[in-house]
């Protein structure tokens, strides 16, 4: 988790002198709470947008959108502090809006936001802001929470961004399968315009289940300049097992900007369709 | 969490052998087993693998002086490398293809 940019991040507003501060996720007023706390943040809204960095790449960041309620306790806001939790790492990020002069109420319903925080493909977060101070310990929470999904490099902005384009997200292998006589498999699909090998690995399931019944490798050494874009054949043979008949190709680049890390694309071939067997039919007539 | 720990690098004269292992912990391995390996400046190459059933392919530059096996009960991959050349001087990686899991690699060095 980091955010977009080291540049001089801004959240004033015409009626609001506000400067955005590194946090460390814990607001002074856990320690030292205070009497008077505002109510908890309204409306908080996630949503995916796309920022360039300064050098011209181009990042998912969550862009994170909320209004104050509009009640009294606006003149104890203080500012907001505003976390990101990458769930599957439990790593935080935390960011805090310091105001530099007293909210008023105005015609208009206060509004913040903060598109900063940059997220990576395919994971999922937890959004949350916080009004500052904070409640006392036995006071009415006053944060928000949202869940957040990034989409994964399949999602067609999503491809386009640095990281997705760094992991291989351009290349499509285009793959086919086709099931051949004698327990073989013939594996096609388009080489991408870069001397790297790739990795085929086939995994085979029993039918309707999950534990697999074979695992092979097949290597494919990096191609010539003159093969970019070709398609490559290879014929996989499958052990001859009673019920594994469900085959999932995965084939892994080794490209440079991604190394041992590159995006997996895979295809599968399902088992066989059993015929239904056909009710006998009795060759006599039962009387009763 | 699984983990892919290498052992068995080393210093070594040309001709000489030398016998790699990797163990996984945190999970049983039944599945496809691989070794790589990386030379100073170079791209990370395909040595050998191994498939569920036993069956084993080499890269054309080891086929004959490495051996690639598995001792399930130890969960354990093995790489026997013999005859070794000074081309055969890299860091081995262990990979585990099925879940993309990676060794932190041994270092083999062979001295002419």
């Known amino acids: 988790l980091r955010l977009l940019d080291h540049r001089a991040l801004v959240c004033s507003q015409p009626g609001l002198n506000c400067t955005v501060k590194n946090s460390t996720c814990l607001d002074d007023s856990w320690i030292h709470p205070r009497n008077l706390t505002p109510s908890s943040p309204k409306d908080l809204q996630i949503q995916l947008h796309f920022a360039h960095t300064q050098q011209g790449d181009l990042f998912p960041v969550a862009h994170i959108e909320w209004t104050l309620q509009t009640d009294a306790s606006i003149l104890y806001l203080e500012g907001a502090e505003l976390s990101v939790l990458q769930l599957n790492t439990n790593e935080r990020l935390c960011v805090r809006f310091e105001f530099l002069s007293k909210l008023r109420h105005h015609h208009r319903r206060w509004r913040f936001t903060f598109s900063h925080f940059v997220v990576d493909p395919d994971q999922e977060y937890e959004v949350t802001v916080h009004h500052l101070p904070k409640p006392i310990p036995d006071g009415d929470p006053n944060h928000q929470s949202k869940n957040f999904l990034v989409p994964d490099c399949e999602h067609a902005r999503m491809k386009v961004t640095t990281p997705c384009m760094s992991s291989g997200s351009l290349w499509d292998p285009n793959i086919t399968v086709e099931t051949l006589e004698a327990h073989q498999l013939r594996v096609s699909f388009t080489l991408w315009n870069e001397s790297t090998h790739y990795q085929i690995l086939l995994t085979s399931f029993p039918h309707m289940e999950n534990h697999s019944c074979f695992e092979h490798m097949h290597h494919i050494p990096a191609p010539r300049p003159e093969e970019f874009h070709q398609r490559s054949n290879v014929t996989l043979t499958l052990r001859n097992l009673k019920g594994c008949c469900r085959h999932q190709v995965q084939i892994q680049p080794f490209f440079s900007s991604c190394l041992n890390d590159c995006l997996r694309h895979s295809a599968t071939v399902s088992c066989p369709e059993m015929p239904d067997t056909p009710e006998p039919i009795p060759d006599y007539m039962p009387l009763w | 969490e699984v983990q892919l720990v290498e052992s068995g690098g080393g210093l070594v004269q040309a001709g000489g052998s030398l016998r790699l292992s990797c163990v996984a912990s945190?999970?049983?391995?039944?599945?496809?087993m691989a070794w790589y390996r990386q030379a100073p400046g170079k791209q990370r190459e395909f040595v050998a693998h191994?498939?569920?059933?036993?069956?084993?392919n080499y890269a054309d530059s080891v086929r004959g002086r490495f051996t690639i096996s598995r001792d399930n009960s130890k969960n354990t991959l093995y790489l026997q490398i013999d005859s070794l050349k000074p081309e055969d001087t890299a860091v081995y990686f262990c990979?585990?293809?099925?879940?993309?899991?990676w060794g932190q690699g041994t270092q083999v060095t062979v001295s002419s």
């Open positions: 990979n585990w293809p099925r879940y993309n899991y």
């Open positions: 191994i498939n569920s059933l036993g069956g084993t």
């Open positions: 945190g999970s049983t391995f039944g599945n496809a």
